[in-house]
Amino acid sequence: MAVTACQGLGFVVSLIGIAGIIAATCMDQWSTQDLYNNPVTAVFNYQGLWRSCVRESSGFTECRGYFTLLGLPAMLQAVRALMIVGIVLGAIGLLVSIFALKCIRIGSMEDSAKANMTLTSGIMFIVSGLCAIAGVSVFANMLVTNFWMSTANMYTGMGGMVQTVQTRYTFGAALFVGWVAGGLTLIGGVMMCIACRGLAPEETNYKAVSYHASGHSVAYKPGGFKASTGFGSNTKNKKIYDGGARTEDEVQSYPSKHDYV
């Protein structure tokens, strides 16, 4: 029962996490214009992985896609790659985990196969979550670097008569969605790996042996219970699980709103 709950919860948490990773990847607000001392702006800029947008206080919003591949910063390409790898691994992990769920019966699938699939999906979720967290963190680091560079420019370039309004960007909502979603996927993956231990069957199950003593007929079963949770003390009878299939993370090598005032 505990195994089924752990596995089911792991699946649900991972599902929410992957949905969040997909949402974060598609969101336009990865970086948003820093409003610092002016909470009201006539023109508000924000950027995503795929397009940049401008929202005027008139309510007019215009978004432009990044129609170049080679002209984009390598870091942005890397973030895109990490997020896509995370989504792909997560999606495969979800597919595998559906068949691995203890509450779902598919033909005469053995517990060992389900355990293998549970571990595989768990590892996939963990890698997926790590990819998302890494992608979001790389983007955040890029933002922090650019923020301080543009801040330095703001205070050094004020000597002339004509000033340039330097647009600084700060963390957008997508970053927080990505971090949370990546964390949830990671947690879900860990839960699946924990559940897998409980699904792993024993190598031997001793038959009940009857010992007949004179006058009494006592039957007892030494070690005759199944270590269903995998946490029992009868390690002698438990199958040592070798980890099953392993997945490789193929990381490919490879920005800006109040009634939108």
């Epitope: 940049s52 309510g59 009634d259």
Partner: antibody, heavy 118, light 113 residues
Framework: EVQLVQSGAEVKKPGASVKVSCKAS????????MHWVKQRPGQRLEWIGM????????NYNEKFKGKATLTLDKSASTAYMELSSLRSEDTAVYYC???????????WGQGTTVTVSS | DIVLTQSPDSLAVSLGERATINCKSS????????????LTWYQQKPGQPPKLLIY???TRESGVPDRFSGSGSGTDFTLTISSLQAEDVAVYYC?????????FGQGTKLEIK
């Protein structure tokens, strides 16, 4: 047809207050910011502030904070601007204007002349 | 606040001739996000409210004759009337539409020579 109709001219004594109205018609009142602009004779236009008819949120030019108060009556599709503690320098034509794409004012009221005289 | 300075203060041009009004901003009005210049031009005739002519520095408002055109980027902008008509006699204002508070130029009075 979009129309912004303002209240008539006002003559006030120094220290008094005046409330100018701007009735909108021909468009969805709650969808556009309403701005107020001041024009003194022979001087440049001055932006006073703005109000969003949907939320009631306002933003004022620092220069007019404490001088102008922007309010609305959503049901009547009317925006109001109240000017307090009137002085001779408040003598001007006041316009309401609707904000559109490009943060430009596409429709203006006909203007309300406020004269402050003792 | 952004300061807009128009030149000249007044201008007399013959009918059918080209009229050029300049507007200089103390800060760049170019938004990097969409590469648009947030400068607007208005025409105001005596006793009337201003009328929108051009926004985004060069986009003509619908219904505005094509003899009116706007150009420029960053801090320097120009309003051009290619062939002056009698009805174009008015005061012309440029407006910063990029940052609050919105500010206007002092105006250029256009007359017929």
């Amino acid at each position: 047809e979009v129309q912004l109709v303002q209240s008539g001219a006002e003559v006030k004594k120094p220290g008094a207050s005046v409330k100018v109205s701007c009735k909108a018609s021909g468009y969805t009142f709650t969808s556009y910011w309403m701005h107020w602009v001041k024009q003194r004779p022979g001087q440049r236009l001055e932006w006073i502030g703005m109000i969003h008819p949907n939320s009631g949120s306002t933003n004022y030019n620092e220069k007019f904070k404490g001088k102008a108060t922007l309010t609305l009556d959503k049901s009547a599709s009317t925006a109001y601007m109240e000017l307090s503690s009137l002085r001779s320098e408040d003598t001007a034509v006041y316009y309401c204007a609707r904000l559109k794409t490009g943060n430009s004012f596409d429709y203006w009221g006909q203007g309300t002349t406020v004269t402050v005289s003792s | 606040d952004i300061v807009l300075t128009q030149s000249p203060d007044s201008l007399a041009v013959s009918l059918g001739e080209r009229a050029t009004i300049n507007c200089k901003s103390s800060q760049s009005l170019l938004n990097s996000g969409n590469q648009k210049n947030y400068l607007t031009w208005y025409q105001q005739k005596p006793g009337q409210p201003p009328k929108l002519l051009i926004y985004w520095a060069s986009t003509r408002e619908s219904g505005v004759p094509d003899r009116f055109s706007g150009s420029g980027s960053g801090t320097d902008f120009t309003l051009t009337i290619s062939s002056l008509q009698a009805e174009d006699v008015a005061v012309y204002y440029c407006q910063n539409a990029y940052t609050y508070p919105f500010t206007f130029g002092q105006g250029t009075k256009l007359e017929i020579k």
